[in-house]
């Protein structure tokens, strides 16, 4: 992937929810769709005192980009202070830098929807000497409203005061007109309507229309996930054609097999994108068997605006076999949020890379939306790691206090899942106290009891990783649950919590 | 077996035109986007032109204009025509045939057919 | 447009002897990256597609490799046959201003 520099986002949380008697508050800053790593986030919190945490980086599925999030908490006068989030990213540039300020809250507003209408061509199809863009700004809340015409992302020298506004019963709607030369529109540049309203920037593009297909269409063809081939028993492999332009062809997807024999009915789903492309999904069900077996399948693309016949073919990934290693902790409390806690789960070591990772609570699956999980990365060695975060409430850890974290990979046995068990009040799970029984959140290999160290001639933890079990056959004090140990190019990861 | 057999080339004049012909046998080709690629004497390969099952054309970006890139399936025939010969046009055209599944290459060539392009 | 970069240019080697050739891309390429033998006043013949497969009747050690930008062609023990100009392919998709071969690489006997 190409260097992409981040969208700075703020996080900022409703007015009305915070409690007027609050000591102290929680904002964020999210920086997304940059690659490569890493970004560098720094708040300005004026004359209050803050303590920040910067999550670790997620990567965005289709794109291979990268997110991340930056918490600050401040406690005092915080109502009336402004905060500025400063995220820098230096394999952009070495002077790329984009500022955030922003208050702690928002209020309730409704925002306006921005829209870009161009004049029409002439009879013959041809442009005009002159082209007229229409920006309507419409359905908001009365307010100030600040609006800027962009030319390929550089501001634009124009007169605004042709800007009108209107009313309509409780909301209001603001155009503004933009007057360009044939030769400035011919020349293939982008144009945009950019809105400021209530601290927040809203904006539509457009340029002239391709001549013909966008170039670079791509197709992708994904491998089935573990959870669909070891648990649901029901694996499907998906063809993705993205960056089609609508036209009267249709595009035209064959499934085949290596083998020769048959295919089972795919299903079929069309999208428009935003940017006016096409993307079309064609979901294919595949045999169990079939695919652990090693049968290859082929996804075959043709459309006119194709210059050729574009093919793809997925079949199990070969090389050697790990079974992932699983470690689940809990996050000790952070001040100001009593009722929510941050559950992690680190799975290491596991090859190849495709993974799953389900949380279950009360034996129930945890729907996916809930937790947040990295892609596969490499660790310093051969097999791979990924992170995975899940928040939970109050009400859930006092119904049971008892968090599971599972991991579905095809080297993992007896049944394809490795599992660990997390407490948010690990000393009070199970009504037990925690000199009583091996505790929860003792972290060791998977594949070994609890607390114990692998038998002889089996891997041991290195001496900078930690078990806290506080036993004289585990380096490192008692208090350390883990430590990873640091990949090339990254700092290291270290975890802490009571054992 | 898979006959792909070019003809149309010969001497010309520098501005005049000619028309490769293409002839296939011993599959469909309907079934399959066509390409031609040419190869000036002692040199390397050249993409000029491929037209898909669809009939829709593309061109390398110093061939748009002066070449054209058809074909009839009824014929069994693909055509190139070049016109305002250029000295440069001098080469080996040949007539290739896209492998049927897709992003694999040009799996059949014809023979060639030599253009020479001189006063 | 995605330019194809092979090297070497030419190589000098004995009967028996490993080669590799190696092809850059200027842009990453999905599948569809072919390799070709061309002998002097033949047409090119298709050795390997989608980087790494073997094209019918090629033999056993004519091999493709890699993913991304770099792609190698390795013939693991040179016949007197494989004296030839060998090109690399960007296959996926012509773009309409692309030269989508590589500019070729003659082994040549040493």
């Known amino acids: 992937a190409s260097t992409q520099s981040p969208s700075v986002f703020p996080l900022t949380r409703c007015c009305k929810n915070i409690p007027s008697n609050a000591t102290s508050v929680t904002l964020g800053c999210l920086a997304t769709g940059y690659f490569p790593e890493p970004v560098m986030v720094t708040w300005d919190t004026g004359s209050l005192n803050g303590t920040t945490m910067t999550l670790p980086a997620t990567t965005l599925t289709l794109s291979g980009h990268y997110a991340t999030i930056s918490l600050l908490t401040v406690s005092g006068a915080w109502a009336k202070q402004m905060f500025t989030c400063r995220v820098a990213h230096t394999p952009s540039s070495t002077d790329w830098v984009d500022n955030k300020t922003f208050s702690v809250c928002s209020r309730d507003f409704t925002p306006p929807t921005v829209k870009i209408l161009q004049s029409s061509c002439d009879g013959g199809g041809h442009f005009p000497p002159t082209i007229q863009l229409l920006c309507l700004v419409s359905g908001y809340t009365p307010g100030t409203i600040n609006i800027t015409w962009l030319e390929d992302g550089q501001v634009m020298d124009v007169d605004l005061s042709t800007a009108s506004t209107t009313q309509e019963g409780e909301l209001a709607s603001t155009q503004s007109e933009l007057t360009l030369s044939q030769k400035h529109w011919l020349s293939d540049r982008t144009y945009t309507c950019q809105v400021t309203y209530q601290g927040h920037t809203f904006e539509d593009s457009t340029k002239k229309c391709a001549d013909s297909n966008p170039r670079g269409v791509s197709a992708y063809l994904s491998r089935p996930s573990p959870f669909d081939l070891f648990i649901r028993k029901s694996p499907t492999i998906t063809c993705l054609v993205v960056d089609l332009a609508p036209s009267k062809g249709t595009v035209n997807l064959t499934w085949s097999r290596a083998s020769g024999k048959p295919v089972n009915h795919s299903t079929r789903k069309e999208e428009k994108q935003r940017n006016g492309t096409l993307t079309v999904t064609s979901t294919l069900p595949v045999g169990t068997r079939d695919w652990i077996e090693g049968e290859t399948y082929q996804c075959r693309v043709t459309h006119p605006h194709l210059p050729r016949a574009l093919m793809r073919s997925t079949t199990k990934t070969s090389g050697p076999r790990a079974a992932p290693e699983v470690y689940a902790f809990a996050t000790p409390e952070w001040p100001g949020s009593r009722d929510k806690r941050t559950l992690a789960c680190l799975i290491q070591n596991f090859m190849p890379e495709d993974i799953s990772v389900q949380w279950l609570h009360n034996e129930v699956q945890l729907p996916d939306a809930r937790h947040s999980t990295t892609q596969p990365r490499k660790t310093k060695g051969s097999g791979f790691f990924v992170f995975s975060r899940l928040e939970v409430t109050r009400a859930e850890w006092e119904q049971k206090d008892e968090f599971i974290c599972r991991a579905v990979h095809e080297a993992a046995s007896p049944s394809q899942t490795v599992q660990r068990a997390v407490s948010v009040n690990p000393g009070l799970a199970g009504g037990s106290a925690q000199s009583q029984r091996a505790p929860d959140r003792v972290l060791c290999h998977s594949g070994q009891q609890q607390g114990l160290p692998r038998a002889a001639g089996g891997s041991v933890p290195h001496p900078r990783c930690h078990c806290g079990a506080g036993r004289a056959d585990w380096p490192g004090p008692p208090e350390l649950d883990v430590c990873v140990e640091e990949a090339e190019g990254e700092a290291p990861w270290t975890w802490t919590g009571l054992c | 077996q898979v006959q792909l057999v070019e003809s149309g080339g010969g001497l010309v004049q520098p501005g005049g035109s000619l028309r490769l012909s293409c002839a296939a046998s011993g599959f469909t080709l309907s079934n399959h986007d066509m390409t031609w690629v040419r190869q000036a004497p002692g040199k390397g390969l050249e993409y000029v032109s491929i037209?898909?099952?669809?009939?829709?054309?593309w061109y390398a970006n110093w061939a748009s204009g002066r070449f054209t890139i058809s074909r009839d399936n009824s014929k069994n025939t693909v055509y190139l025509q070049i016109d305002s010969l250029r000295a440069e046009d001098t080469a080996t055209y040949y007539c290739?045939?896209?492998?049927?599944?897709?992003?694999?290459?040009?799996?059949?060539w014809g023979q060639g057919t030599l253009v020479t392009v001189s006063s | 447009d995605i330019q194809m970069t092979q090297s070497p240019s030419s190589v000098s080697a004995s009967v028996g002897d490993r080669v590799t050739i190696t092809c850059q891309a200027s842009e990453s390429i999905y599948s569809g990256l072919a390799w070709y033998r061309q002998k002097p006043g033949q047409p090119p013949k298709l050795l390997i597609y989608?980087?790494?497969t073997l094209a019918s009747g090629v033999p056993s050690r004519f091999s493709g490799s890699g993913s991304g930008t770099e792609y190698a062609l390795t013939i693991s023990s040179l016949q007197p046959e494989d004296f030839a100009t060998y090109y690399c392919?960007?296959?996926?998709?012509?773009?309409?201003?692309?030269?989508?071969f590589g500019g070729g690489t003659k082994v040549e006997i040493k």
């Open positions: 037209i898909n099952t669809y009939g829709n054309h």
């Open positions: 989608d980087h790494s």
């Open positions: 290739a045939r896209e492998t049927h599944h897709g992003s694999s290459g040009i799996d059949h």
């Open positions: 392919q960007h296959a996926d998709y012509a773009h309409h201003s692309d030269n989508v």
